[in-house]
């Protein structure tokens, strides 16, 4: 990877081991846990990052109301199975043979079952709503400045094409970033909205995945934007299938 050539490191993924063992002695970086070679000029898939993480030695509503089908990642961390492209396999199972189906961002979208559970396809998450609450500031941020800064962040830091940042909503102290990306819209080489959202989530938590870069220093017109709570909602192209028992719980 040209991005990793000089001193054989991976700028976009610190959860790698890099070695001059690629073709012709070129630098090659492999994700921890899976051993898959990653492209260090772009973001690494969330599945490979989660696998690496598990293996590493751990009023007037202008805001969007998440749809009834929106998923929140309540299950937390698990050691996922990734396919040869680095994507989540549709069916995930734990060591005790409990299985469930996930969407393209690895969030469970069915009840848990046993090894007989079938997950026919990996359902794409096409809409992600990132819901942030910022720490109190002297005054509200200017909405258009905030919008511009967040769009710049996703474009420059996460290399996400601007067309996939659908909207930025602001109602102090709540900020919502909407990412939308249908299967038909995503071209080869495009960063996946799920991967961009995961990098952003880790940045916000002060757990940057980028090699050697300082943590995320978000400023709007010089004013620090400090996030104190993050909630991420995932909307799939096909609604999730949970039993009524869960829905009424």
């Amino acid at each position: 990877h040209t991005a990793a050539q000089d001193n054989c490191t991976c700028p976009t993924n610190k959860m790698t081991v890099c070695s001059p063992d690629g073709p012709g002695g070129r630098c090659q970086c492999r994700a921890l846990g899976s051993g898959m070679a990653v492209d260090c000029s772009t973001l690494t898939s969330k599945c490979l990052l989660l696998k690496a993480r598990m293996s590493a030695p751990k009023n007037a509503r202008t805001l969007v109301r998440p749809s009834e089908h929106a998923l929140v990642d309540n299950d937390g961390l698990y050691d996922p199975d990734c396919d040869p492209e680095g994507r989540f396999k549709a069916r995930q199972c734990n060591q005790t043979s409990v299985c469930w189906c996930v969407n393209s961002v690895g969030v469970r979208r069915t009840d848990k079952g046993d090894l007989s559970l079938r997950c026919d396809e990996l359902v794409r998450t096409h809409h992600i709503l990132i819901d942030l609450r910022h720490r109190p500031t002297a005054g509200a941020f200017n909405h258009s400045d905030l919008d511009a800064e967040l769009r710049r962040l996703f474009r420059e830091r996460y290399r996400l094409h601007p067309k996939f940042v659908a909207a930025v909503h602001y109602e102090q102290p709540t900020i919502q970033i909407e990412l939308r990306q249908n299967t038909s819209q995503k071209a080869a080489g495009d960063v996946d909205i799920g991967d961009a959202a995961y990098y952003f989530e880790r940045d916000i938590k002060g757990e940057s995945l980028f090699q050697g870069r300082g943590g995320l220093d978000l400023r709007v017109r010089g004013e620090p934007l400090q996030v104190e709570r993050t909630l991420i909602y995932y909307l799939d192209e096909i609604p999730p299938k949970f039993s009524m028992k869960r829905l009424t719980a």
């Epitope: 990877h1 054989c8 081991v17 070695s19 001059p20 063992d21 690629g22 073709p23 012709g24 002695g25 090659q28 492999r30 921890l32 846990g33 899976s34 051993g35 898959m36 070679a37 990653v38 492209d39 772009t42 030695p57 990734c82 396919d83 040869p84 492209e85 680095g86």
Partner: antibody, heavy 116, light 113 residues
Framework: QVQLVQSGPEVVKPGASVKISCKAS????????LGWVKQAPGQGLEWIGN????????NYNEKFKGKATLTADTSTSTAYMELSSLRSEDTAVYFC?????????WGQGTLLTVSS | DIVMTQSPDSLAVSLGERATINCKSS????????????LAWYQQKPGQPPKLLIY???TRESGVPDRFSGSGSGTDFTLTISSLQAEDVAVYYC?????????FGQGTKLEIK
């Protein structure tokens, strides 16, 4: 030139443990993955696991977890594989190999015989 | 785990003739990030360690005679020896080093007819 020299043959009793060594020379030991491979008599090749000596990251084939323990001593550029609770089915030639696309470097193999 | 299946298990070819060994993987070995296939071919003679012939599915290791060639992508791969020589008698293995655990094919024994 790159060389991997392994320790000599071992004959051990069932239930015992053994530690095989692999001394590397001719390259920077700490910046390449070093893998271990098993070949039972008349059988094919099985990947046991690998170690990255520079950071001590280790990966195991699930089949060999609890059986093999990989370590490395960077001061002597030597990798080790300890095999425990030995049984007759552990009788095999064990190879160390430098991994990667240009992974043409293998040790000569260490024959381990488990016999009472 | 990725399962590597070689065919045939054994092969007898006349000197100077072409020998072809196939290897099929249960999952794609093509890395979409760098468009490289993580597939290697090894030759092993009795009492010796395996010798790397081909890596990246088609790149010949330095010092390997040009009668050896590799082809294929994704899940289907082929090792071809264009003109068999006596010293090519050996067991040949394909290996995936795409995702842990790395896996080998069961081997193909090549003999002179």
């Amino acid at each position: 030139q790159v060389q991997l020299v392994q320790s000599g043959p071992e004959v051990v009793k069932p239930g015992a443990s053994v530690k095989i060594s692999c001394k590397a020379s001719g390259y920077t030991f700490t910046i390449y993955w070093l893998g271990w491979v098993k070949q039972a008599p008349g059988q094919g090749l099985e990947w046991i696991g690998n170690i990255f000596p520079g950071s001590a990251y280790i990966n195991y084939n699930e089949k060999f977890k609890g059986k093999a323990t990989l370590t490395a001593d960077t001061s002597t550029s030597t990798a080790y594989m300890e095999l425990s609770s030995l049984r007759s089915e552990d009788t095999a030639v064990y190879f160390c190999a430098r991994e990667g696309s240009n992974s043409g470097y293998w040790g000569q193999g260490t024959l381990l015989t488990v016999s009472s | 785990d990725i399962v590597m299946t070689q065919s045939p298990d054994s092969l007898a070819v006349s000197l100077g003739e072409r020998a072809t060994i196939n290897c099929k993987s249960s999952q794609s070995l093509l890395n979409s990030g760098n468009q490289q296939n993580y597939l290697a071919w090894y030759q092993q003679k009795p009492g010796q360690p395996p010798k790397l012939l081909i890596y990246g599915a088609s790149t010949r290791e330095s010092g390997v005679p040009d009668r050896f060639s590799g082809s294929g992508s994704g899940t289907d791969f082929t090792l071809t020896i264009s003109s068999l020589q006596a010293e090519d008698v050996a067991v040949y293995y394909c290996q995936s080093d795409h995702i842990y655990p790395y896996t080998f094919g069961q081997g193909t024994k090549l003999e002179i007819k």
